[in-house]
């Protein structure tokens, strides 16, 4: 791989927090980091067809990293698409021009070098503009596990056009059974967007019990079609020796 | 290798619709590609209308979205324009473009202007 | 919606190198494109992707894009350059095309 230069190309980043060296010492190494993640915060790219793509990785590093790129996990090559694509080192950027719908995917760019590597995963969609049924986020809602007692935050990203609605679910048990006679998962609605529902997208369970541990699921949908997805909440007890001792002498049951 | 070209009236009464068409020769107007319409009020600068894909798709400047409609004629390998209850601040000279991201190619266009 | 902002004019001797600025919000994060229009024709594309240049555009003409600012530089300008000059992106999270304003480029003597 070229080296990119180790400056932030995009961005008069002066957080850096190395120390100017004498001509005759070795840099400091430095494993990896990114040097704008706020720039890299929009994971879910979706597209129309035919136009450009352009996904940024900003980083620096000592000695300079490398750039390389993956699509779904495995090595991305230009003759992987038609028309290939281009990879701006200087900028930490890929671009894929005219893109089609063989190009959505997972890419994802590895920057490292001897020191460290850091890697960040952008998904991409290629849609119709005509109305389509909604795009979630993937990854999103993550399995979480928590201490009893804790807050938890499930967040659903979601991409639709037209307006869609958002439910989050819980899968349930009624009479011992997950299953209702109609052979559907029993579900209690926890939250949908409406009037009195502000950010849809995240779900906040608060002083979390075990009996909240399951699957939640986030369901959207419009007039065109629907979309869910699903996270397990896990809610651990605190170990066994950080308990608070009640009990002062053995205590026997017959 | 590809041509565009704009036809239509080159005089609109105001609020009368304008209607322009492009003819694509050379290729085909189903290839990977957004037909645009572009315009530019004399001595002002370039204002984006709206395009459309060979699918039907299409995407509107939210400042004319109420008044414009683009379609697209496959048979005919060519794509129109319409925009509806035109004032003297529509008179310009409307062109036609190929696109993906950017336009590589476009019509030489032509000028409408609205008076009556 | 997206702004880009460009400087009305630009004015550089011959053989000198001139810089036209295309200013928005984080537009380092899109793709800008560049043309050139001449009096009575239509634009020509001069520099698309940031900084590649179309078949038959000298290589004096370059472009970079980073943080809110696009360049489009023309070095050892000609006569012949002399035009206005717009810049482009296609706003992805509007879904919608934009020009500047347009920069009008004279070229002095």
């Known amino acids: 791989d070229a080296l990119p230069s180790s400056e932030d190309d995009d961005d008069d980043d002066d957080s850096s927090s190395e120390e100017k060296e004498t001509d005759n010492t070795k840099p400091n190494p430095v494993a990896p980091y990114w040097t704008s993640p706020e720039k890299m915060e929009k994971k879910l790219h979706a597209v129309p067809a035919a136009k450009t793509v352009k996904f940024k990785c900003p980083s620096s590093g000592t000695p300079n990293p490398t750039l390389r790129w993956l699509k779904n996990g495995k090595e991305f090559k230009p003759d992987h698409r038609i028309g290939g694509y281009k990879v701006r080192y200087a900028t930490w950027s890929i671009i894929m021009d005219s893109v089609v719908p063989s190009d959505k995917g997972n890419y994802t760019c590895i920057v490292e070098n001897e020191y460290g590597s850091i890697n960040h995963t952008y998904q991409l969609d290629v849609v119709e503009r005509s109305p389509h049924r909604p795009i979630l986020q993937a990854g999103l809602p993550a399995n979480k596990t928590v201490a009893l007692g804790s807050n938890v935050e499930f967040m659903c990203k979601v991409y639709s056009d037209p307006q869609p609605h958002i439910q989050w679910l819980k899968h349930i048990e009624v009479n011992g059974s997950k299953i209702g006679p109609d052979n559907l998962p029993y579900v209690q609605i926890l939250k949908h967007s409406g009037i009195n529902s502000s950010d849809a997208e995240v779900l906040t369970l608060f002083n979390v019990t075990e009996a909240q541990s399951g699957e939640y699921v986030c369901k959207v949908s419009n007039y065109i079609g629907e979309a869910n997805q699903s996270a397990w909440l896990t809610v651990t007890r605190p170990a066994l020796e950080e308990r608070p001792a009640v009990m002062t002498s053995p205590l026997y049951l017959e | 290798q590809v041509q565009l070209q704009e036809s239509g009236p080159g005089l609109v009464k105001p609020s009368g619709t304008l209607s322009l068409t492009c003819a694509v020769s050379g290729g085909s107007i189903s290839s990977n590609n957004w037909w645009s319409w572009v315009r530019q009020p004399p001595g002002k600068g370039l204002e984006w209308i709206g395009e459309?894909?060979?699918?039907?798709?299409?995407s509107y400047n939210p400042s004319l979205k109420s008044r414009v409609t683009i379609s697209v004629d496959k048979s005919k390998n060519q794509f129109s324009l319409k925009l509806s209850s035109v004032t003297a601040a529509d008179t310009a000279v409307y062109y036609c473009a190929r696109g993906t991201d950017w336009y590589d190619l476009w019509g030489q266009g032509t000028l409408v202007t609205v008076s009556s | 919606s997206y702004v880009l902002t460009q400087p009305p004019s630009v004015s550089v001797a011959p053989g000198q190198t001139a810089r036209i600025t295309c200013g928005g919000n984080n537009i380092g994060s899109e793709s800008v494109h560049w043309y050139q229009q001449k009096p009575g024709q239509a634009p020509v594309l001069v520099v698309y992707?940031?900084?590649d240049r179309p078949s038959g555009i000298p290589e004096r003409f370059s472009g970079s894009n980073s943080g809110n600012t696009a360049t489009l530089t023309i070095s050892r300008v000609e006569a012949g350059d002399e035009a206005d000059y717009y810049c482009q992106v296609w706003d992805s999270t509007s879904d919608h095309r934009v020009f500047g304003g347009g920069t009008k480029l004279t070229v002095l003597g």
């Open positions: 459309i894909y060979h699918s039907g798709s299409t």
């Open positions: 992707d940031d900084s």
